[in-house]
């Protein structure tokens, strides 16, 4: 769900943690339209995930903490 | 309906551990956050961290980061919640609270509609 | 010290509207995370009033509503009720820190 480097929409799947190696955020008032989190996997895809949704914000923090103990 | 049943008051030593539960009933265990409030005497509501079942792995807020360890058993649909290297400072009352809609909510996200009876925890020597 | 900022106290006499404020900053309310509320009555666990900036859960009387703007929000009360006197808690997300967070609380007297 995304086009020149910007989701347009989100996932609709739960991803694991486990499947995923990193995150680079989207910001709405930097060229793209909607907010997102852009989820990397071991297998080189990027997945465009809502935000707001508890489980991405779960990852999100997990995947920070990850960053920190490195 | 949903009912969060934790467990009962702890009297401990400083220095010593504690493990509060919380078991869930009236609802899928696994599609839902789980989290644990700290509330000190007189004081306000310290969210500590929280659990997805299904994911396994816990997150917490920077502050308790070290001190509390979050689990979850989803054959008896209770979370847990132990802190270690009890002071004087950890006397609170601890509540186990559940998210109104599943993990992959967004309007609901954070909305934590269930709560526990809450669980006093007094560290005194 | 909160994330979230609330005013220690607020009053207001039966039957009158009070409003309890909740300032954030860019990484939580103003950065369109949705904001919670709860009410907490002397000696019970706190109790979902208000979620998604502007919902009631079933059971809550519409006497109580939400609202966001910016970098805060606001939580109204009309037709006050001796019985609404309690703690009153905002919530919201805050993205650099990765975890939600509670304003500090804000004591509603009813004169």
């Known amino acids: 769900a995304s086009n020149f480097d910007c989701c347009l929409g989100y996932t609709d799947r739960i991803l694991h943690p486990k499947f995923i190696v990193g995150f680079t955020r989207q910001l709405a008032n930097e060229g793209c339209d909607i907010n997102a989190i852009i989820f990397h996997t071991k297998k080189k895809l990027s997945v465009c995930a809502n935000p707001k949704q508890t489980w991405v914000k779960y990852i999100v923090r997990l995947l920070s903490k990850k960053v920190k103990n490195m | 309906e949903v009912q969060l049943v934790q467990s009962g008051a702890e009297v401990k030593k400083p220095g010593s551990s504690v493990k509060v539960s919380c078991k869930a009933s009236g609802d899928t265990f696994d599609s839902y956050a789980f989290s644990w409030v700290r509330q000190a005497p007189g004081q306000g509501l310290e969210w500590m961290g929280g659990i997805i079942p299904m994911f396994d792995t816990p997150i917490y807020a920077q502050k308790f980061q070290g001190k509390v360890t979050i689990t979850a058993d989803t054959s008896t649909s209770t979370v847990y919640m132990k802190l270690s290297s009890l002071r004087s400072g950890d006397t609170a009352i601890y509540y186990c609270?559940?998210?109104?809609?599943?993990?992959?909510?967004?309007?609901?996200?954070?909305?934590?509609?269930?709560w526990g009876r809450g669980t006093l925890v007094t560290v005194s020597s | 010290q909160a994330v979230l900022t609330q005013p220690s106290s607020v009053s207001g006499a039966p039957g009158q509207r009070v409003t309890i404020s909740c300032t954030g900053s860019r990484s939580n309310i103003g950065a369109d995370y949705d904001v919670q509320w709860y009410q907490q009555l002397p000696g019970t666990a706190p109790k979902l009033l208000i979620y998604g900036n502007n919902n009631r859960p079933s059971g809550v009387p519409d006497r109580f509503s939400g609202s966001k703007s910016d970098r805060s929000a606001s939580l109204a009360i009309t037709g006050l009720r001796a019985e609404d006197e309690s703690d009153y808690y905002c919530?919201?997300?805050?993205?650099?820190?990765?975890?939600?967070?509670f304003g500090g609380g804000t004591k509603l007297t009813v004169l």
């Open positions: 919530q919201s997300y805050d993205s650099s820190l990765s975890v939600w967070v």
């Open positions: 609270a559940r998210e109104w809609g599943g993990y992959y909510s967004s309007e609901s996200s954070g909305a934590l509609q269930y």
